[in-house]
């Protein structure tokens, strides 16, 4: 299935991305809890992953979607808005064989999926079910519908400093 816009560009058949089965540690943090680099705009907090001026946090603990949203908010971030193929592929590179909540929810009254910034998602969400109003990534190469009340890991996202 196409994840973003319908096309024949072969987006879902990429060269070599897939589940990352092993977790590798990040650089050693500095004492203030930030991984500092020499380049402007590349500072992410300890245990966050940097890519293209954004910081991403992949939790190891699990919680419901609402709790995940509040967790990210408490860290000055939001659940990840995975609105480009590039961002999705990066996250697929750094997620292991687990499901992670992202900032995508189904609006029943509109019958459409929206990102938490309110932008519409026109792509494909697999595993749709009457009771599945939230979405995860990580176990498959697609966005999967999931129950908002079941506990999964979460991906938070914010601007690098």
């Amino acid at each position: 299935p196409q994840i973003f816009n319908k096309s024949n560009d072969g987006f879902t058949t990429t060269r070599s991305y897939g589940t990352v089965s092993q977790i590798f540690g990040s650089s050693s943090p500095s004492p203030n809890g930030f991984i500092t680099t020499r380049s402007y705009g590349t500072v992410c907090p300890k245990d966050w992953e940097f890519y293209q001026a954004r910081c991403f946090f992949l939790s190891t603990s699990e919680s419901s979607w609402n709790e995940s949203r509040d967790f990210c908010k408490g860290k000055g971030s939001t659940l990840a808005i995975v609105n480009t193929p590039e961002k999705l592929k990066f996250l697929q590179d750094i997620t292991d064989a687990e499901k992670y909540f992202i900032g995508l929810i189904y609006h029943r009254e509109e019958k459409r999926w929206r990102w938490i910034n309110n932008s519409v998602f026109n792509g494909n969400v697999t595993n749709q079910n009457q009771n599945f109003n939230c979405a995860t990534i990580g176990l498959t190469k697609t966005f999967d519908a999931a129950s908002c009340d079941i506990s999964y890991r979460r991906i938070c996202e914010k601007n690098a400093k």
């Epitope: 973003f4 816009n5 319908k6 096309s7 560009d9 072969g10 987006f11 990429t14 060269r15 070599s16 991305y17 990352v20 977790i23 590798f24 540690g25 990040s26 650089s27 680099t37 020499r38 380049s39 705009g41 590349t42 992953e49 940097f50 890519y51 293209q52 001026a53 609105n83 480009t84 193929p85 590039e86 961002k87 592929k89 990066f90 590179d93 750094i94 932008s119």
Partner: antibody
Framework: QVQLLQSGAELVKPGASVKISCKAS????????IHWVKQKPEQGLEWIGY????????KYNEKFKDKATLTADKSSSIAYMQLNSLTSEDSAVYFC???????????WGQGTTLTVSS | DIVMSQSPSSLAVSAGETVTMSCKSS????????????LAWYQQKPGQSPKLLIY???TRESGVPDRFTGSGSGTDFTLTISSVRAEDLAVYYC????????FGGGTKLEIK
């Protein structure tokens, strides 16, 4: 097949502005960012910035943020770069290219030669 | 910004020889969790647009001869061309795609 077709060579006077186009075909335009690269004669490549037509995200090399303005027309799959307050330093070949995380989409336009001269 | 430095700026070799060129970045381009270095090599022949040779520091682009080999990790990278041919006359650029995008200054390969 994926193609990026750029507009033709431009000869403009100092102080003027110019708008270069890049017509994309062979893939879904909104799925991949369009980048712009400058190459002065006999010199290296400089990244100017990119526009992501899907979500409207635009980022510039700090050096070009007051020089270049990037736009895109989703309906026609055309990306544009406007260069303003032109000087002889802006004389160069300008390339558009698309880019994808895993380099499946790494195609370049043929280049547009800009000459700034009175 | 990340600064990319290439050396040498030019070199001349005879056909059949092996050549190596260096690219250094001002900060690490490795994401250890993704196991990827966000570094690519491009070849630009005279009068042409650049062409992708190597991505993720060491993965050869489809259709690129195996004479071209990328290596290195973190901040130090190398492009090696074995059994150089006349058609390899070009400028070779490295580019980082980890924090926005930056090209190195290029290495011009000339054939004696």
């Amino acid at each position: 097949q994926v193609q990026l077709l750029q507009s033709g060579a431009e000869l403009v006077k100092p102080g003027a502005s110019v708008k270069i186009s890049c017509k994309a075909s062979g893939y879904t335009f909104t799925d991949h960012a369009i980048h712009w690269v400058k190459q002065k004669p006999e010199q290296g490549l400089e990244w100017i910035g990119y526009i992501s037509p899907g979500d409207g995200d635009i980022k510039y090399n700090e050096k070009f943020k007051d020089k270049a303005t990037l736009t895109a027309d989703k309906s026609s799959s055309i990306a544009y770069m406007q260069l303003n307050s032109l000087t002889s330093e802006d004389s160069a070949v300008y390339f558009c290219k698309n880019f994808d995380y895993d380099f499946i989409f790494d195609f370049w336009g043929q280049g547009t030669t800009l000459t700034v001269s009175s | 910004d990340i600064v990319m430095s290439q050396s040498p700026s030019s070199l001349a070799v005879s056909a059949g020889e092996t050549v190596t060129m260096s690219c250094k970045s001002s900060q690490s381009l490795l994401n250890s969790r993704a196991r990827k270095n966000y570094l690519a090599w491009y070849q630009q022949k005279p009068g042409q647009s650049p062409k992708l040779l190597i991505y993720w520091a060491s993965t050869r682009e489809s259709g690129v001869p195996d004479r071209f080999t990328g290596s290195g990790s973190g901040t130090d990278f190398t492009l090696t061309i074995s059994s150089v041919r006349a058609e390899d006359l070009a400028v070779y650029y490295c580019k980082q795609s980890y924090n926005l995008y930056t090209f190195g200054g290029g290495t011009k390969l000339e054939i004696k």
